[in-house]
Interface confidence: low
């Protein structure tokens, strides 16, 4: 199709090379009443048609994206092409940064309902270029963590090094719906609740001489309980003593409840008492059993092929620890009588 | 649990100090909150304040109460007693119970504020 | 401000019957169900009975049920006990820019 009529917007992607980032490129189908590319040869301004098959971003889910070669090309249907490059709705993610996102993306409606529709389509021109900027040694990240229940805010990483005197206004997204309210370089949760997670993207428009174009980042905004206060706590095994059957295989289960903390190094594992011995036993890798908001539950077995009268002499403990501290579960065998 | 203290008879126009102590748990770990009730009446929500130890009101109680905290206590000034204040106070600990938010798990007793001339 | 309409303001039911109270919010609370039960008896402190619309509190009996989102809430009591009677409140959270809570104006349950 002939893309000359699409409208054009120019996005630019300063990526740092320090850390992982996303980057987003929304459908932005122009409203027909504000717009001359959809129906231009139908509607004037004031006028509204008897069906707006194409409403911008909100309603329009079922769009087509296109990359355009610079070497002149047909257009390539993204989803081919590009595995690094997903699309979901009328949103591209980028999964990975690099200068070679740097191109043409066009999107338009995959159903063409009427001849008026052909030029309702947009062209993105997205430059990619890596972070020179060294005199901002400490913007924000791409991805955000904001405590549930205290006050919080997310700052445009883009701009986390102005002040919000300096800062140009702001457009802000959240997961493609627009955040009209939020004009500066930081949103301020005065309480943040689970709902204020999500991805973020903050829009700022830069002019030289030349031409102006949209600076856009995109932040991932995580909302966390604060760093727990207590050591893990066993929640199996609950009985220090358990019945066997000699020959017989056998597996022990350790599950321990960990509180959330940041910076998460969880130890889970099993020793056996003998007499005067202790020693690890080489088991099976530990597993996260369920992870909510608040705490993880991992679980570590230890096999024994066959119970052996020397195992019922034996203290089979689990111990597991976090950063405040460690808890210990001991477990005796017993020969089932009968 | 949760106990309020300091209602007591005042005339109009006098400031009167509710303290609200815990025991069981770290009033600092929580955000704590105000509600009253004037006999036979509904509940009204007053404020709250944050386990960090700013506080939040309702609209028609900015500039007549004033909620604080120290390391063992929440406390709620009424700046200038009006007979409308006539009423029980009750002290409640909040709760975080995910996505949607807080609510008030743990009452005290109340204390009661009797305003007369 | 948010206002809470609980209706109706009294009602009285048989032991072993079914009680349902309403309470509509003047707008949605947080997240579309930040809204809470709670159960007064005279002299008392209220009791929080179910939080979240619908998640009974610890050791509140299953005859007690709540439903509804955003700004329509429903509390049904069934198997009606004399325990029950007092009255009852509903309870809302808003955005943290209006005022941050309301309740209801309260609905007393007398049971014969």
């Known amino acids: 199709f002939n893309i000359s009529g699409c409208s054009t917007k120019k996005l630019l992607w300063t990526y740092s090379t320090r850390s992982e980032e996303e980057f987003v490129l929304f459908c932005d189908l122009p409203e027909p009443q504000k717009s001359h590319f959809c129906h231009r040869n139908r509607l004037s301004p004031k006028q509204v048609p008897e069906h707006l098959p194409f409403m911008g971003s909100n309603d329009l889910s079922d769009v087509q994206w296109y990359q355009q070669p610079s070497n002149g090309d047909p257009l390539e249907d993204i989803r081919k092409s590009y595995p690094h490059i997903i699309q979901d709705k009328c949103t591209l993610h980028f999964l990975t940064p690099g200068v070679n996102n740097s191109g043409s993306y066009i999107c338009r409606p995959k159903m063409i309902k009427s001849p008026y529709d052909v030029a309702c389509c947009v062209k993105m021109i997205l430059e990619v270029k890596p972070q020179t900027n060294a005199s901002c040694e400490y913007s924000a990240s791409h991805k955000q963590d904001l405590l549930l229940g205290s006050t919080g805010s997310i700052s445009c990483p883009s701009l986390s090094c102005q002040s919000d005197a300096q800062s140009p206004a702001v457009t802000w997204y959240k997961n493609g719906k627009l955040l009209s309210v939020e004009r500066s370089n930081r949103i301020v949760v005065d309480e943040v609740y689970d709902y204020h997670q999500g991805t973020y993207v903050c829009d700022y428009t830069q002019s030289d001489t030349v031409s102006s174009w949209t600076v856009r980042a995109v932040v991932q905004v995580r909302t966390i309980v604060g760093d727990t206060k207590l050591k893990p706590d066993i929640l199996d095994p609950v009985e220090d003593t358990l019945e066997v059957e000699l020959g017989k295989p056998l597996t022990i289960s350790c599950k321990a409840r960990f509180g959330f903390e940041r910076v998460f190094n969880p130890v889970i594992k099993w020793y056996i008492k003998d007499s005067d011995l202790e020693w690890e036993v080489s088991v099976p890798e530990a597993k996260s059993i369920k992870s909510t908001l608040k705490d993880e539950i991992i679980e570590r077995n230890i096999i024994l092929e066959k119970v052996t009268q020397r195992d019922l002499r034996r203290k089979f403990v689990c111990f597991v620890q976090n950063s405040i501290g460690n808890t210990t579960q001991s477990v005796q065998l017993k020969e089932k009588r009968g | 649990s949760v106990e309020e203290s300091g209602g007591r008879l005042v005339t109009p126009g006098t400031p009167l100090t509710l303290t609200c102590t815990a025991s069981?748990?770290?009033?600092?770990?929580?955000?704590m909150t105000w509600v009253r009730q004037a006999p036979g009446k509904g509940l009204e929500w007053i404020g709250f304040i944050k386990a960090g130890g700013s506080a939040g009101y309702a609209s028609w109680a900015k500039g007549r109460f004033t909620i604080s905290k120290t390391s063992a206590t929440v406390d709620l000034r009424i700046t200038g007693a009006t007979t409308e204040d006539t009423g029980t106070y009750f002290c409640v600990r909040m709760f975080y119970a995910g996505d949607s938010g807080h609510y008030f798990d743990l009452w005290g007793p109340g204390t009661l504020v009797t305003v007369s001339s | 401000a948010a206002v809470l309409t609980q209706t109706p303001s009294s009602v009285s039911a048989a032991v072993g019957g079914t009680v349902t109270i309403n309470c509509q919010s003047s707008?949605?609370?947080?997240?579309?169900?930040?809204l809470a039960w709670y159960q007064q008896k005279p002299g008392q402190p209220p009791k929080l009975l179910i939080y979240?619309?619908?998640t009974l509190a610890s050791g509140v009996p299953s005859r007690f049920k709540g439903s509804g989102s955003g700004t329509q809430f429903t509390l049904i009591m069934s198997d009606l006990e004399c325990g029950d009677a007092a009255t009852y409140f509903c309870a809302g959270g808003y955005d943290r820019f209006i005022d941050t809570f309301a309740f209801g104006g309260g609905t007393e349950v007398v049971v014969k």
């Open positions: 979240d619309a619908s």
């Open positions: 707008q949605s609370v947080n997240n579309a169900k930040n």
């Open positions: 069981g748990f770290d009033i600092n770990n929580y955000h």
